[in-house]
Amino acid sequence: AESCTSRPHITVVEGEPFYLKHCSCSLAHEIETTTKSWYKSSGSQEHVELNPRSSSRIALHDCVLEFWPVELNDTGSYFFQMKNYTQKWKLNVIRRNKHSCFTERQVTSKIVEVKKFFQITCENSYYQTLVNSTSLYKNCKKLLLENNKNPTIKKNAEFEDQGYYSCVHFLHHNGKLFNITKTFNITIVEDRSNIVPVLLGPKLNHVAVELGKNVRLNCSALLNEEDVIYWMFGEENGSDPNIHEEKEMRIMTPEGKWHASKVLRIENIGESNLNVLYNCTVASTGGTDTKSFILVRKADMADIPGHVFTR
């Protein structure tokens, strides 16, 4: 069954067929003998009952009030009444944009990631039996598609697919031609799911230290939730009892990615800790990134250009 008109506030464009369907339709069929009435109120007019004689543009069928077509003066409040059931809608009819094939107020925006599945399907189940043909336009230029009853686009999105897609259904009623437009604003964006992880700061860091003292080497990265960050040093990690990997800290960024940092703590620095590489690596499905730290005795600092030092 076609969805009933559940939203209490509706905006429609002048000149298009339109319908209101109340939401107790199944109930109404059960109580065939019950009086069912449609009313309109607008401005000074209070609850005027609607019937086919009210206007040649209005039709009543079972659960539905139809407009052929809806016009600006149809703006107002509409009521359906049956026994102790009432449903109310506030209808706002707006002007058609004469300079475009669609009206901006009637746009549905969708964002699609590049290379992900993207579809536009031109369907209108309520008017389906009356539709002669349907055309699909992109940025108001007609697309030549095989099916002129329900034109469809189904593909993996490319950046060139971005634009305004308008489905225009052409239908006949009582010898007159009408059309109904449904427009989608499609924006194609980069893959939002994963980033290439990156280590923050220079790739090579010389750290000035004193023998017998302690040092903390901080490795920070911007990464995805499933990515890992780890330290590598010496022949075998963990062979030096003075070297400790601290617990990894993670903070979520506003974009849903992670800022991670992992500290390597070297206590009681000895000669064996100098001039060797302490490598920090971030690894993901998309690859790895590594940065290196070298401990240098303070006395030897003069031999190395100043810009390569970190503290």
């Epitope: 939203r7 905006t11 939401c23 339709c25 107020r105 549905t108 925006s109 969708k110």
Partner: antibody
Framework: QVQLVQSGAEVKKPGASVKVSCKAS????????MHWVRQAPGQGLEWMGT????????YYNQKFQGRVTMTRDTSTSTVYMELSSLRSEDTAVYYC??????????????WGQGTTVTVSS | EIVLTQSPGTLSLSPGERATLSCRAS??????????MHWYQQKPGQAPRLLIY???NLETGIPDRFSGSGSGTDFTLTISRLEPEDFAVYYC?????????FGQGTKLEIK
């Protein structure tokens, strides 16, 4: 007229997943977009994402990308929101809510009663 | 992403007074004469309730002491004469573009 009825409260351990359901009243399901909004204790409202039940199109807030999945079952007029890799900061009340599909109509005039999800070890 | 900033964070007033709540968007949420900004009221333990849609339209069943105004980036929710039941948290929300977003809220408390 539309009513949204959500599943009951959940208690989960960190790292687990939770799946919350939201059933819409008859006849209205495919014509409205469904959204999920959460509210941590004492905090504001946070929009998580949306699903268009007519074609299953989804769009998620980047903050939840990769952890959240929204699905629908048109036969039962139900939408689902699954959140994985739960952390303590995911403890919140999760609301489903409905809007029109036009951009201008994406305001929330009907809300579910809320589902409390507690993440605790 | 459009960021909404509400001010003040907390507003202390007495019943009968006029309340003015502000919401500023990081970019325009208006187009072709419509402003895609909406306002909600939330009381403790309850789901939010729509008050105003499209900047200035009063939701059905909401008292007419509530009104909304503004366009572009600056919007205002006004409660002309505060009733005891109006003390709650108020949120603005934009639908100009995805992702949809809410302001951080303004708490309206009794002075």
């Amino acid at each position: 007229q539309v009513q949204l009825v959500q599943s009951g409260a959940e208690v989960k351990k960190p790292g687990a997943s939770v799946k919350v359901s939201c059933k819409a009243s008859d006849y209205t399901f495919t014509s409205n977009w469904m959204h999920w909004v959460r509210q941590a204790p004492g905090q504001g409202l946070e929009w998580m994402g949306t699903i268009d039940p007519s074609d299953s199109y989804t769009y998620y807030n980047q903050k939840f990308q990769g952890r959240v999945t929204m699905t629908r079952d048109t036969s039962t007029s139900t939408v689902y929101m699954e959140l994985s890799s739960l952390r303590s900061e995911d403890t919140a009340v999760y609301y489903c809510t409905t809007s029109g599909d036009y951009d201008a109509d994406r305001y929330f005039d009907v809300w579910g009663q809320g589902t409390t999800v507690t993440v605790s070890s | 992403e459009i960021v909404l900033t509400q001010s003040p964070g907390t507003l202390s007033l007495s019943p009968g007074e006029r309340a003015t709540l502000s919401c500023r968007a990081s970019k325009s949420v208006s187009t072709s004469g419509d402003s895609y900004m909406h306002w909600y009221q939330q009381k403790p333990g309850q789901a939010p309730r729509l008050l105003i849609y499209l900047a200035s339209n009063l939701e059905t069943g909401i008292p007419d002491r509530f009104s909304g105004s503004g366009s572009g980036t600056d919007f205002t929710l006004t409660i002309s004469r505060l009733e005891p039941e109006d003390f709650a948290v108020y949120y603005c929300q934009q639908s100009r573009e995805l992702p949809l977003s809410f302001g951080q809220g303004t708490k309206l408390e009794i002075k």
